[in-house]
C-alpha cells in the first residue's frame, strides 16, 4: 500500500509526527524562573500535535529523537540594558521525572536582547521540558519574538 | 508494500517532502525593505523542491507545518556599527495573500552582526513569505553567511 | 502494508533517518583551528545513527539534503572578552573530499559568547564536515552549551 494512502488511512500521530510550537503565556512567580507556555489554534499560530501542556510546561508523549528549538526576546531591552542586567540566561531542560533531570540547551544574552538556538536530543514519553529564564528582565510575549517548540525526528 | 519501495515508486513531492534553501540575490529599491532571494543548483548549494520563487519571494505549494529558518549577516559591521545604525531588524512573515499577512519571526541585530533563528509554523498553499530588513545596512551575499529556507514537517 | 508496520520491519537506516548529535571532545593542536567532536550514549545525550566520526570529524554515509545545526559557547567569556579577542569566527564546511571543499555556515561572535545557527544543505556519502574556530578563545565543553548535529531531511 502506498505511503500517500497510508497517510490518509492512519492518524498522523501513529506515524510519529509529534510536533508542538508554543507561545509565551507568562513568567513564574518569585523564586520560579520557569517560563509558562500556551498553545493552540485559538491563540494564533501555536499548536500541539502529540505533546501536551502540563501547567504551562511541555510534556512529551512519544519516545524518540526530537529537534528542540527556542527563541526568547527580552521585552524592554537595548545592548546596554542586557549588559547591565547580565547575566540573563535561558536554559531548556528535562525537569521531570526528577530521575531524568538534565539541562539540554543553555544560552546567555550578554549584550544582545534575543537568543535563539536548536538541538537534537533523545526524549522519552513523560519527559517534561522546562525553560528557565534567570535574571530580572521580562521576556516579550510577542508571538514572533518568543516561541518554543519540538519536532519528533526519528525513533 | 515497503516504504523503501514506495520511495522509489512515488515522486518525492507526493510524499510531502517540500523543502527549499535560498541565497540572497539583492535588496529592494527605496522604500522596499524586502530581501530578494534566488535558488537553484546552478547557483551553488541552494535549491527549491516544491516551493517556488515569485519575484524573489518564496511561495509555498503544499499545506502543512513547516520549519522556517534564516541567517542574515551584515556586509560590513562591528558591534559599534550595529548599535550606531540601530534598530536594524529582520522579520520573516507571510506577506500574501493579504488576508493571511502576519509576522512569523523577528530579531534585532543590537550589537551583533549576524542573526539566526528558526521556528515551526503552519503554512498554506499560496502563502508567500517575505523577509524584511529594516535600516540602511547592506547584507552579505556570501552563501555561508546569509540564507533562508523552509522544510515541510507534517500535514 | 502500513508505514507503522514498515517501521518495525525495516532497519531505520534504510528509511533514510540518518541523524547525529555530537558534543565537543577537544580543540586541535596549534595551527589546527578544527573542533574535535565525540558522540555516543555512553557520553550522555549525544549519538550517531548513520553518520560516523573520523578522527573527531563527522562523515556522512547517505546522500541527501541535511539540516546542519551548531551551537558553540566560549568558555571564559564576557561581552568585553569577546570584543577584545574579537573577531572569533566559527565556520562549518565540507573539508573532504578536497574536490567538494566549501564553507557551509559562518558566524562571528562579536560581543556575544555564543553562536547558534542551522541550515539545509545537500551532502553526499563520504563528505566530511569540519568546524573551524578561529581566534584564541576556548570553547566550552558543557554539553548544553556546545554541540553540533545533522539530520537527514530528504533525498
Amino acid at each position: 500500500q502506498r505511503f500517500a494512502q497510508a497517510q490518509q488511512q492512519l492518524p498522523l500521530e501513529s506515524l510519529g509526527w509529534d510536533v508542538a510550537e508554543l507561545q509565551l503565556n507568562h513568567t513564574g512567580p518569585q523564586q520560579d524562573p520557569r517560563l509558562y507556555w500556551q498553545g493552540g489554534p485559538a491563540l494564533g499560530r501555536s499548536f500541539l500535535h502529540g505533546p501536551e501542556l502540563d501547567k504551562g510546561q511541555l510534556r512529551i508523549h512519544r519516545d524518540g529523537i526530537y529537534m528542540v528549538h527556542i527563541q526568547v526576546t527580552l521585552a524592554i531591552c537595548s545592548s546596554t540594558t542586557a549588559s547591565r542586567h547580565h547575566p540573563t540566561t535561558l536554559a531548556v531542560g528535562i525537569c521531570s521525572p526528577a530521575s531524568r533531570s538534565i539541562s539540554l540547551l543553555r544560552l546567555s544574552f550578554h549584550q544582545g536582547c534575543t537568543i535563539a538556538s536548536q538541538r537534537l536530543t533523545p526524549l522519552a514519553r513523560g519527559d517534561t521540558l522546562c525553560t528557565n529564564l534567570t535574571g530580572t528582565l521580562l521576556p516579550s510575549r510577542n508571538t514572533d519574538e518568543t516561541f518554543f517548540g519540538v519536532q519528533w525526528v526519528r525513533p | 508494500q515497503r516504504f523503501a519501495q514506495a520511495q522509489q515508486q512515488l515522486p518525492l513531492e507526493s510524499l510531502g517532502w517540500d523543502v527549499a534553501e535560498l541565497q540572497l540575490n539583492h535588496t529592494g529599491p527605496q522604500q522596499d525593505p524586502r530581501l530578494y532571494w534566488q535558488g537553484g543548483p546552478a547557483l551553488g548549494r541552494s535549491f527549491l523542491h516544491g516551493p517556488e520563487l515569485d519575484k524573489g519571494q518564496l511561495r509555498i505549494h503544499r499545506d502543512g507545518i513547516y520549519m522556517v529558518h534564516i541567517q542574515v549577516t551584515l556586509a560590513i559591521c562591528s558591534s559599534t556599527t550595529a548599535s550606531r545604525h540601530h534598530p536594524t531588524t529582520l522579520a520573516v512573515g507571510i506577506c500574501s495573500p493579504a488576508s493571511r499577512s502576519i509576522s512569523l519571526l523577528r530579531l534585532s541585530f543590537h550589537q551583533g552582526c549576524t542573526i539566526a533563528s528558526q521556528r515551526l509554523t503552519p503554512l498554506a498553499r499560496g502563502d508567500t513569505l517575505c523577509t524584511n530588513l529594516t535600516g540602511t545596512l547592506l547584507p552579505s551575499r556570501n552563501t555561508d553567511e546569509t540564507f533562508f529556507g523552509v522544510q515541510w514537517v507534517r500535514p | 502494508q502500513r508505514f507503522a508496520q514498515a517501521q518495525q520491519q525495516l532497519p531505520l537506516e534504510s528509511l533514510g533517518w540518518d541523524v547525529a548529535e555530537l558534543q565537543l571532545n577537544h580543540t586541535g593542536p596549534q595551527q589546527d583551528p578544527r573542533l574535535y567532536w565525540q558522540g555516543g550514549p555512553a557520553l550522555g545525550r549525544s549519538f550517531l545513527h548513520g553518520p560516523e566520526l573520523d578522527k573527531g570529524q563527522l562523515r556522512i554515509h547517505r546522500d541527501g539534503i541535511y539540516m546542519v545545526h551548531i551551537q558553540v559557547t566560549l568558555a571564559i567569556c564576557s561581552s568585553t572578552t569577546a570584543s577584545r579577542h574579537h573577531p572569533t569566527t566559527l565556520a562549518v564546511g565540507i573539508c573532504s573530499p578536497a574536490s567538494r571543499s566549501i564553507s557551509l555556515l559562518r558566524l562571528s561572535f562579536h560581543q556575544g559568547c555564543t553562536i547558534a545557527s542551522q541550515r539545509l544543505t545537500p551532502l553526499a556519502r563520504g563528505d566530511t564536515l569540519c568546524t573551524n574556530l578561529t581566534g584564541t578563545l576556548l570553547p566550552s565543553r558543557n554539553t548544553d552549551e556546545t554541540f553540533f548535529g545533522v539530520q537527514w531531511v530528504r533525498p
Epitope: - | H26, T27, G28, P29, Q30, Q31, D32, P33, A75, I76, C77, S78, T80, T81, R84, T136, L137, L138, P139, S140, R141, N142 | H85, H86, P87, T89, S108, T134
Partner: antibody, heavy 120, light 107 residues
Framework: EVQLLESGGGLVQPGGSLRLSCAAS????????MSWVRQVPGKGLEWVSV????????DYADSVKGRFTISRDNSKNTLYLQMNSLRAEDTAVYYC?????????????WGQGTLVTVSS | DIQMTQSPSSLSASVGDRVSITCRAS??????LNWYQQKPGKAPKLLIY???SLQSGVPSRFSGSGSGTDFTLTISSLQPEDFATYYC?????????FGGGTKVEIK
Amino acid sequence: EVQLLESGGGLVQPGGSLRLSCAASGFTFSSYAMSWVRQVPGKGLEWVSVISGSGGRTDYADSVKGRFTISRDNSKNTLYLQMNSLRAEDTAVYYCARHDYSNRFYFDYWGQGTLVTVSS
Amino acid sequence: DIQMTQSPSSLSASVGDRVSITCRASQSISSYLNWYQQKPGKAPKLLIYAASSLQSGVPSRFSGSGSGTDFTLTISSLQPEDFATYYCQQSYSAPPTFGGGTKVEIK
C-alpha cells in the same frame, strides 16, 4: 570589460554644490553595490559612501553625512554623488568603485577618478 | 573607526628582490584585510582580498598573509611594473579604512 568613468569634477567655492557621475559598462550594473572613495592629491584614500545595487540602502562616512547624497539610475547604468555645502577639506580626486559581488566592502574595479577642488 | 598603520611608508628595492609590506589594525579584524596597488595618476587596483585570496588576473608573485591585527603583503620577485604605492584596507568594520600607503621605489 568592466569600465567605470567619472565626470562632473571641477572648481567650486566653499559652500557650493557639485554633482559627480560615474558611467558603468561591461557588467550588470544593478547587481552590484557601488561606493565613492576619495583621495587628497598625494595623500591616502578615504571611503565616502555606499549604495546597494537596487538603490534602497545607503551609508555615509561621518565626515560627509548630511551634506552628500549617493544615488543611482540603473536604467542609465550611472552612479551619482550630490555634494552640497562643500568645504576646503572635500578637495580630492573622487573615485567610483564597484564592490565585490558578496557586498563585502572591498572594491574590485575602480574608475580613473575626477578631481574636485573647493577653493575661493 | 579602526586605524590602519602601514610600514614602511616607503622602500627602495631592485628588480628580483623579495619585498614585504606590513599593515597593522588598531583592533582585531579577523581576515577582513585587502591590498591595493596604485600607480601615479591611476586608480587603485585590487590585488588581495580577505587577507590571502589573490584577485583574478593578479600575478602569483603577490601573496598576502596574517589575521587579527597583523598582516603582510609579499612580492616574491619584484618586477619593473610593480613599482607603485600599496594600500591596505580593512573591510571588517564601518567605515572601511585604508592605511597610509607604502611607496615602492627603484633602488
